[in-house]
C-alpha cells in the first residue's frame, strides 16, 4: 500500500470579506482529506503581509491584522495540509481573499431625472417610476433601498411607494397642480451597517401638453412623458 | 465544451440604457467568474468589471461605477451587463468572458454583442 | 491600477521566423505568497473575439501550438512565436490578473512581411 498525500477539496479556496473587518474574525476556511485517514494539520505559507492566520486543526483561517484593500486584491495565500504521523506527506493549495468595499456610498438615482413632467392639468392621479443605485459592492443580494418623501411638507401631494430594492414608484395624492415644476425630495436608505442615507431631488414640471409632449417655446427642449 | 451566447446588436441613444445578455453552458454556472470586456472600434480591450454567480458579488471597473450594473439568473446560467446613461464613447463591441480555473484570466469570451450610440 | 504597456505597436515578421512581443507592467506581479506570475496572453484576429493563448505568464492554454510561448517575471514579459504562420496575422495584448481592476496592454499587431 502506497501512503498518498492528503487531498484538498478544492483546487483554490476563496473567501470575500469587507476590508473594515474586525481583527480576530473568521475569514474563510479549507478543507483536506488523508487517503489513509490520518490527522491533518494546516498551515499557510506565504502570508507576506501577516494579515492571517489558521487553525491547524480544523482550517478555519482568521485575520489578525486591519485588511487594506488598497494594498491590492485578491491577496493569495498557500495553505498546505500535512499528515500528522506517518510520512508527513503534504499538499499544498491557495487561499484567495477578496476584499470588498465598506459601505461608504450613499445611495442615488440611478440615471439623470430631469425631463420628467405630467400634462397638466391631471385628469387623473399620476405615477413615475425611478431607481436607485449606491457605488457599493452588495454580496448575495443586490442593493436593499428603503424610500420615503424628503420632507413631511410633501406628503399632502405626493406619496411613494416600494417596488423592489433599487425601485420605487412617486405618485400624486390628487390632480390639483400648478402649472409649473415641483421639486420632490425622496430620502433614500441603503440598509447597510452603518446604513447611509441619500436625500435626491425629482424635478417634475406639470404644462401644456401639444401631441403627448410638454409643450415649450421656440428653443427648448421637449421634455420626456411619464404617467 | 464551453459555450457563452451573447445576445444581439443594439442601437441606442445617447442618454438611454442597455442590457447585453450572456447565456453560458457547458460547464458549472456557479463555478466561475464571468467578467464583460469592451472593445471601441479599431481600439484595444478594456475591462469593465465581473460577477461571482455563487453569490452574485459584484467588482466594477472604477471607471463604469455609477453607470454599469451586472446581475446574474442563475436559473437559466445567464449574466447580464446594463450601461446607464450612454453616450457615444460606448459604441463599442462588449464581451462576456469566463474566467480560468483557479483564477482570474479570461478563459472563453462569448462572440460580442455590437451597441451603437448614436442620435 | 496597474498599467500595462506593449511593445511594439506593430511587428512585421517573415513566414518562419521569430515574433517577439514585450509586455512591461507598472507593478510586479510575481506573488509572493503563490511565487506565481499573473499575467496573460491573448491573441485577437480581425472581427473575432480575443483567445487566450497563455496564463501564469508560461501556462500554455489547452490546445495553444507550442509554437507559443511565454516568459518573464516580475515586470518584464515576452509572447514568442517561434516560427511565424500565415493564422498567426492577428493583435496580441497582455493582461495582468494580479490585483483589480484587471487590466490590458494595448495591443501589439504582428503582419507578415
Known amino acids: 500500500d502506497v501512503n498518498e498525500a492528503p487531498q484538498f477539496s478544492q483546487h483554490v479556496f476563496q473567501a470575500k470579506v469587507s476590508e473594515d473587518v474586525a481583527i480576530g474574525t473568521k475569514v474563510g476556511n479549507v478543507t483536506a482529506k488523508d487517503p489513509e485517514g490520518l490527522d491533518i494539520s494546516y498551515s499557510l505559507r506565504g502570508d507576506t503581509r501577516g494579515w492571517l492566520k489558521i487553525d491547524h486543526v480544523t482550517g478555519e483561517i482568521f485575520s489578525v491584522a486591519p485588511l487594506d484593500r488598497e494594498a491590492g486584491s485578491p491577496y493569495r495565500v498557500q495553505v498546505v495540509a500535512t499528515e500528522v504521523g506517518g510520512s508527513s506527506l503534504s499538499s499544498v493549495s491557495e487561499f484567495h481573499l477578496i476584499l470588498m468595499d465598506v459601505n461608504d456610498n450613499p445611495p442615488r438615482l440611478a440615471k439623470d431625472y430631469t425631463g420628467l413632467f405630467f400634462c397638466h392639468p391631471l385628469s387623473a392621479p399620476g405615477s413615475l417610476i425611478f431607481e436607485a443605485t449606491d457605488d457599493d459592492q452588495h454580496l448575495f443580494r443586490g442593493p436593499h433601498f428603503t424610500f420615503s418623501l424628503g420632507s413631511g411638507s410633501l406628503q399632502n401631494d405626493w406619496e411613494v411607494s416600494k417596488i423592489n430594492g433599487t425601485h420605487a414608484r412617486l405618485s400624486t395624492r390628487h390632480t390639483e397642480f400648478e402649472e409649473r415644476e415641483y421639486v420632490v425630495l425622496i430620502r433614500i436608505n441603503d440598509g447597510g451597517r452603518p446604513p447611509l442615507e441619500g436625500i435626491v431631488s425629482l424635478p417634475v414640471t406639470f404644462c401644456s401638453c401639444v401631441e403627448g409632449s410638454c409643450f415649450r417655446p421656440a428653443g427648448h427642449k421637449h421634455h420626456h412623458h411619464h404617467h | 465544451q464551453v459555450q457563452l451566447v451573447q445576445s444581439g446588436a443594439e442601437v441606442k441613444k445617447p442618454g438611454a440604457s442597455v442590457k447585453v445578455s450572456c447565456k453560458a453552458s457547458g460547464y458549472t454556472f456557479t463555478d466561475y467568474w464571468m467578467n464583460w470586456v469592451r472593445q471601441a472600434p479599431g481600439q484595444g480591450l478594456e475591462w469593465m468589471g465581473a460577477i461571482d454567480p455563487s453569490d452574485r458579488y459584484t467588482n466594477y471597473n472604477q471607471k463604469f461605477k455609477g453607470r454599469v450594473t451586472m446581475t446574474v439568473d442563475t436559473s437559466t446560467s445567464t449574466v447580464y451587463m446594463e450601461l446607464s446613461s450612454l453616450r457615444s464613447e460606448d459604441t463599442a463591441v462588449y464581451f462576456c468572458?469566463?474566467?480560468?480555473?483557479?483564477?482570474?484570466?479570461?478563459?472563453?469570451w462569448g462572440q460580442g454583442t455590437l451597441v451603437t450610440v448614436s442620435s | 491600477d496597474i498599467v500595462m504597456t506593449q511593445s511594439p505597436d506593430s511587428l512585421a515578421v517573415s513566414l518562419g521566423e521569430r515574433a517577439t512581443i514585450n509586455c512591461k507592467s507598472s507593478q510586479n506581479l510575481l506573488s509572493s505568497g503563490t511565487q506565481k506570475n499573473y499575467l496573460a496572453w491573448y491573441q485577437q484576429k480581425p472581427g473575432q473575439s480575443p483567445k487566450p493563448l497563455i496564463y501564469?505568464?508560461?501556462t500554455r492554454e489547452s490546445g495553444v501550438p507550442d509554437r507559443f510561448s511565454g516568459s518573464g517575471s516580475g515586470t518584464d514579459f515576452t509572447l514568442t512565436i517561434s516560427s511565424l504562420q500565415a493564422e498567426d496575422v492577428a493583435v496580441y495584448y497582455c493582461q495582468q490578473h494580479h490585483y483589480f481592476p484587471w487590466t490590458f496592454g494595448g495591443g501589439t499587431k504582428v503582419e507578415i512581411k
Open positions: 468572458a469566463r474566467g480560468g480555473y483557479g483564477d482570474y484570466w479570461f478563459a472563453n
Open positions: 501564469f505568464a508560461s
